[in-house]
């Protein structure tokens, strides 16, 4: 009787195993093993047992022990099962961006791996199993369909093989494919909204705003803004599912005419675009010309207004006669004209829009100085110890410097609240000076002081105010 040990072996591909062939008779004529595998006999004492090392086991094999005894010939087989993990576990390539709502087919291919009865293919989203099937065929292929949702964005899909040899006393061997990261997106069918000036003036800046709602993921959206060949550099502000791209656009004389403004939004592998036309025009402000911006009182002044040849002007609200790009007016300068604004308004039609430009010039009329009774009274009479504010206003352009001096040296504090004392009394020479000349005016301050009179035999006090006035002959003096 021939026996073999072990009768069943599971071993890794390319591995080795020791097989013992035994016979029940003491003196077998023959004892051996039949196998295509490389073998090496290990020497043992006795005739009824032989041990062989079988090496480089690449596939399942059934080596057979045989013996020839006096009572006849017999055989025994050992079953070698080779295990190995797949050589390739791969997800079929897919575009990384997938629109939400689309059916996505995931296909996993597995090459190799044994024993196949113990090999399972699993499709996963993250750690969640989507499908589990035994590996069948070479290559084995497992597919599943996923309806793309927003919350799949950034999810990792993978394929895993499981070679479960735990029933054979070994472990669970896992192989995982490279993950496929899904990028989901929503790009609405509506084109982006583009807000920009319809007309834009040369050498100015305009603001262009391109916006779109209902995007996902909004942060991944690319916005391209361009005016003609000029690429704009927008500042993009994001909302939950919207963006607003704001850019400044500068135009020069070379851009004059009609230009195409485009806003393109690219998300995933889709895009939406909006086009608009912008008319770039040149319209300098009208020119207000004064014969002289600064004139003395009584001077004849000509005010001219000149604008763009196609413009229509009004000067100080009066339209040009005939209606056109030029207007003028004449005047004799008076103090009331000082600071008077001459405003020229020009209107030009551009692409159906009326463009208005204004230019204002101010006339300076030099006059004065002036000191008159109304604004600088010549006489003040104040009670002693009262609080008073001497007022004297000089007029003129430029505004005159005003000082009122008594005896050429002592100032009267104009516009200040003063306590009236005897020292304040007297005649002050008020002098207003400017580059236009000077005027002087005498101002007399009278101080009323109480005179005390004793009654007959009584101590009664009669407060009788007595005006005391001292006149000084003043020269043209000026002092601080």
């Amino acid at each position: 009787q021939t026996s073999v040990s072990p009768s069943k072996v599971i071993l890794p591909r390319g591995g080795s195993v020791l097989v013992t062939c035994s016979t029940s008779c003491d003196q077998p004529k023959l004892l051996g093993i039949e196998t295509p595998l490389p073998k090496k006999e290990l020497l043992l004492p006795g005739n009824n047992r032989k041990v062989y090392e079988l090496s480089n086991v690449q596939e399942d094999s059934q080596p057979m022990c045989y013996s020839n005894c006096p009572d006849g010939q017999s055989t025994a087989k050992t079953f070698l099962t080779v295990y190995w993990t797949p050589e390739r576990v791969e997800l079929a390539p897919l575009p990384s961006w997938q629109p939400v709502g689309k059916n996505l087919t995931l296909r996993c291919q597995v090459e190799g791996g044994a024993p196949r009865a113990n090999l399972t293919v699993v499709l996963l989203r993250g750690e969640k199993e989507l499908k589990r099937e035994p590996a069948v065929g070479e290559p084995a292929e497992v597919t599943t369909t996923v309806l793309v949702r927003r919350d799949h964005h950034g999810a990792n899909f993978s394929c895993r093989t499981e070679l479960d040899l735990r029933p054979q006393g070994l472990e669970l061997f896992e192989n995982t494919s490279a993950p496929y990261q899904l990028q989901t997106f929503v790009l609405p069918a509506t084109p982006p909204q583009l807000v920009s000036p319809r007309v834009l003036e040369v050498d100015t800046q305009g603001t262009v705003v391109c916006s779109l709602d209902g995007l996902f993921p909004v942060s991944e959206a690319q916005v391209h803004l361009a005016l003609g060949d000029q690429r704009l550099n927008p500042t993009v502000t994001y909302g939950n599912d919207s963006f607003s791209a704001k850019a400044s656009v500068s135009v020069t004389a070379e851009d004059e005419g009609t230009q195409r403004l485009t806003c393109a939004v690219i998300l995933g592998n889709q895009s939406q675009e909006t086009l608009q036309t912008v008319t770039i025009y040149s319209f300098p402000a009208p020119n207000v010309i004064l014969t002289k911006p600064e004139v003395s009182e009584g001077t004849e002044v000509t005010v001219k207004c000149e604008a763009h040849p196609r413009a229509k002007v009004t000067l100080n609200g009066v339209p040009a006669q005939p209606l056109g790009p030029r207007a003028q007016l004449l005047l004799k300068a008076t103090p009331e004209d000082n600071g008077r604004s001459f405003s020229c308004s020009a209107t030009l039609e551009v692409a159906g829009q009326l463009i208005h430009k204004n230019q204002t010039r101010e006339l300076r009329v030099l006059y004065g100085p002036r000191l008159d009774e109304r604004d600088c009274p010549g006489n003040w009479t104040w009670p002693e110890n009262s609080q008073q504010t001497p007022m004297c206003q000089a007029w003129g352009n430029p505004l005159p410097e005003l000082k009122c001096l008594k005896d050429g040296t002592f100032p009267l504090p104009i516009g200040e609240s003063v306590t009236v004392t005897r020292d304040l009394e007297g005649t002050y020479l008020c002098r207003a000076r400017s580059t236009q000349g000077e005027v002087t005016r005498k101002v007399t301050v009278n101080v009323l002081s109480p005179r005390y009179e004793g009654g007959s035999g009584g101590s009664g006090l009669n407060d009788i105010f007595e005006a005391q006035k001292i006149e000084w002959h003043e020269e043209n003096l000026y002092f601080q």
């Epitope: 005896d407 040296t409 020292d423 002092f479």
Partner: antibody, heavy 120, light 110 residues
Framework: EVQVLESGGGLVQPGGSLRLSCAVS????????MGWVRQAPGKGLEWIGI???????YYASWAKGRFTISKDNSKNTVYLQINSPRAEDTAVYYC??????????????WGQGTLVTVSS | DIQMTQSPSTLSASVGDRVTITCQAS??????LSWYQQKPGKAPKFLIY???KLASGVPSRFSGSGSGTEFTLTISSVQPDDFATYYC????????????FGGGTKVEIK
């Protein structure tokens, strides 16, 4: 050119009398008040008094009586009379043109001063 | 009587420092205050009138402020030429005054 120039300083004996002169040029005395200021050696400035354009005079309280300011418009000269000088009157005496504004010469005019030494 | 009180009497500063001198009048002199600079052996030089107006030729680092009884002279960044004695003077009243000038402030090199 606008100028003021003091003269008359020097050594004077206590109890005597002294008159300092201030000659002005480039402006009229009738249109400016003129003042006198003194400075004792190592001390601060001390206001003595002023003569107004009307010839009226104003003095510091300590100067009343011994000091007299006068002027002669025709000679364009201002004077300071010191009666009974004392050792404490030893000082540099400055003549000052008083009025000032932005249309004047751009500075208040001071002379270079004249030194009076009272000593026996 | 109007008395003029100046402080401090002495002030030590380095080139580039900001310096402030104050002058107090015993009663209101409104804005009628002048500032002078004096160097040893020289006549005083007029700096500021009407409390804050710069006399012509005076550098803009000098400035004056105040009205009524409190006045200030400021040198924003002291230069070597600014080490001198500074005086304030009231130019308002002549009524029984002892001295129209403050006692002076000597600005010396630290």
């Amino acid at each position: 050119e606008v100028q003021v120039l003091e003269s008359g300083g020097g050594l004077v004996q206590p109890g005597g009398s002294l008159r300092l002169s201030c000659a002005v040029s480039g402006f009229s005395l009738s249109s400016h008040a003129m003042g006198w200021v003194r400075q004792a050696p190592g001390k601060g400035l001390e206001w003595i008094g002023i003569i107004g354009s009307s010839d009226r005079t104003y003095y510091a309280s300590w100067a009343k009586g011994r000091f007299t300011i006068s002027k002669d418009n025709s000679k364009n000269t201002v004077y300071l009379q010191i009666n009974s000088p004392r050792a404490e009157d030893t000082a540099v005496y400055y003549c000052v043109r008083d009025p000032y504004d932005s249309y004047d010469d751009g500075y208040r005019l001071w002379g270079q001063g004249t030194l009076v030494t009272v000593s026996s | 009587d109007i008395q003029m009180t100046q402080s401090p009497s002495t002030l030590s500063a380095s080139v580039g420092d900001r310096v402030t001198i104050t002058c107090q009048a015993s009663q209101s002199i409104y804005r009628y205050l002048s500032w002078y600079q004096q160097k040893p052996g020289k006549a005083p030089k007029f700096l500021i009138y009407d409390a804050s107006k710069l006399a012509s030729g005076v550098p803009s680092r000098f400035s004056g402020s105040g009205s009524g009884t409190e006045f200030t002279l400021t040198i924003s960044s002291v230069q070597p030429d600014d080490f001198a004695t500074y005086y304030c003077q009231q130019a308002y009243s002549s009524g029984s005054i002892d001295n129209a000038f403050g006692g002076g402030t000597k600005v010396e090199i630290k």
